[in-house]
């Protein structure tokens, strides 16, 4: 149930956790029980869910998503303050691509955090998450320029380039996600 | 021939805990998606909770997150649902159906249900 | 209240053809999720009926069919019989909702006579 993030420590960035231990991996330890927890995974740099056996396990273990925000996300609680205030990119905007459970093939837009552009993606009909988007407008609109105008200009020439995957299949995914909504 | 038996249902007071199993057979358990699907007495259907083949991604209905745990147990062919913190309108019918079988996105095939009655 | 809504109860004659309705929203069926229709027999667990908007299961009489426009669905059932006295259900998924399953609140159909 542990959950994985080997990537190299490079693509960390500048992004520097407030304490040591939100770096550690997230450990659902040797036993047996199923408690829902959050840990914050370095190289999404957000607090994720995670199933902790109930014994032992690290340090980078909440009882709560707030909780975590605020003890390992540098400057959590100003940008709270902020977003409450403005136009500001929903929750859900930062959510990992989820093609949900089942074997359809939709074509949807999200929001990539690592590019800051709605990207297409191929969801399979079923659950997954809100950063799933019918139409590249409404993705644009909601987390690309959340409250901002009406966009264009080269950005929009180089996004009409890249979804031109999807007339040979979808792309591969290089991660490997582990959800637990 | 496919088959699911849920059982685990019971009467628990509010507030209490109870554990509901499906027992899988006649096909590839760990190949498929699983749900769980409740029904209150005399009223229509609710999804509750999903979970991948594998159980690496699980999802829950608003009504019931943080409060129930869908698992899997693919070496026993079993399917879970740990129910915390339970409530009246929790009182209902508990399906287990497997999920996208041949029908991509339906709920193909169901047991036949165990009653679970959360009462004082 | 459901997500989707189906009228209460619908009934027929033997012999003749019922049609139960399922509305939803742009964010549902109008949002491109299949529909799919379950048939519940009294006492008994639900069945798959209608999948993919029109698709029958191996078992299923050709006299179900289902159908999807825009943001509503229909299941059709022509030559009633008694044995067909059921709740119906439709079921899609919900963006709004990250893409969770919703029912219809069910629909009763009785055969008359």
């Known amino acids: 149930l542990s959950e994985e993030a080997d990537d190299t420590d490079s693509e960390l960035g500048s992004m520097k956790p407030l304490h040591t231990f939100c770096a550690m991996k997230a450990d659902d330890g040797p036993c047996k029980a199923m408690i829902r927890s959050y840990f914050f995974n370095m190289y999404t740099h957000q607090c994720e869910e995670f199933i902790y056996g109930g014994c032992e396990g690290n340090e980078n273990r909440f009882d709560t998503l707030e909780e975590c925000k605020k003890t390992c996300i540098p400057g959590y609680e100003k940008t709270a303050v902020k977003a409450a205030s403005g136009a500001e990119r929903p929750d859900f905007c930062f959510l990992e691509e989820d093609p949900g459970l089942c074997r359809g093939y939709m074509k949807r837009y999200l929001y990539n955090n690592q590019t800051k552009q709605c990207e297409r993606f191929v969801y399979g009909g079923c659950l997954g998450n809100r950063n799933n988007f019918e139409t590249l407008d409404e993705c644009k609109k909601i987390c690309e320029n959340p409250g901002g105008g009406s966009g264009g200009g080269l950005n929009d020439i180089f996004e009409a380039q890249k979804i031109e995957w999807h007339e040979g299949g979808p792309p591969h995914h290089h991660h490997h996600h582990h959800h637990h909504h | 021939q496919v088959q699911l038996v849920e059982s685990g249902g019971g009467l628990v007071q509010p507030g209490g805990s109870l554990r509901l199993s499906c027992a899988a057979s006649g096909f590839t358990f760990s190949s498929y998606a699983m749900s769980w699907v409740r029904q209150a007495p005399g009223k229509g259907l609710e999804w509750v909770s999903a979970?991948?083949?594998?159980?690496?991604?699980?999802y829950y209905a608003d009504s019931v997150k943080g409060r129930f745990t869908i698992s899997r147990d693919n070496s026993k062919n079993t399917l879970y649902l740990q129910m915390n913190s339970l409530r009246a309108e929790d009182t209902a019918v508990y399906y287990c159906?497997?999920?996208?079988?041949?029908?991509?996105?339906?709920?193909?095939?169901w047991g036949q249900g165990t009653m679970v009655t959360v009462s004082s | 209240q459901s997500v989707l809504t189906q009228p209460p109860s619908v009934s027929g004659a033997p012999g003749q053809r019922v049609t139960i309705s399922c509305t939803g929203s742009?964010?549902?069926?109008?949002?491109?999720?299949?529909v799919h229709w379950y048939q519940q027999l009294p006492g008994t667990a639900p069945k798959l009926l209608i999948y993919g908007n029109s698709n029958r299961p191996s078992g299923v009489p050709d006299r179900f069919s289902g159908s999807k426009s825009g943001t509503s669905a229909s299941l059709a059932i022509t030559g009633l019989q008694a044995e067909d006295e059921a709740d119906y259900y439709c079921?899609?998924?919900?963006?709004?909702?990250?893409?969770?399953?919703?029912f219809g609140g069910g629909t009763k159909l009785t055969v008359l006579g």
């Open positions: 979970i991948s083949g594998s159980g690496g991604s699980t």
């Open positions: 159906a497997i999920l996208g079988a041949t029908s991509l996105s339906a709920f193909d095939i």
């Open positions: 742009s964010s549902n069926i109008g949002a491109g999720y299949d």
């Open positions: 079921q899609s998924y919900d963006s709004s909702l990250s893409g969770s399953g919703v």
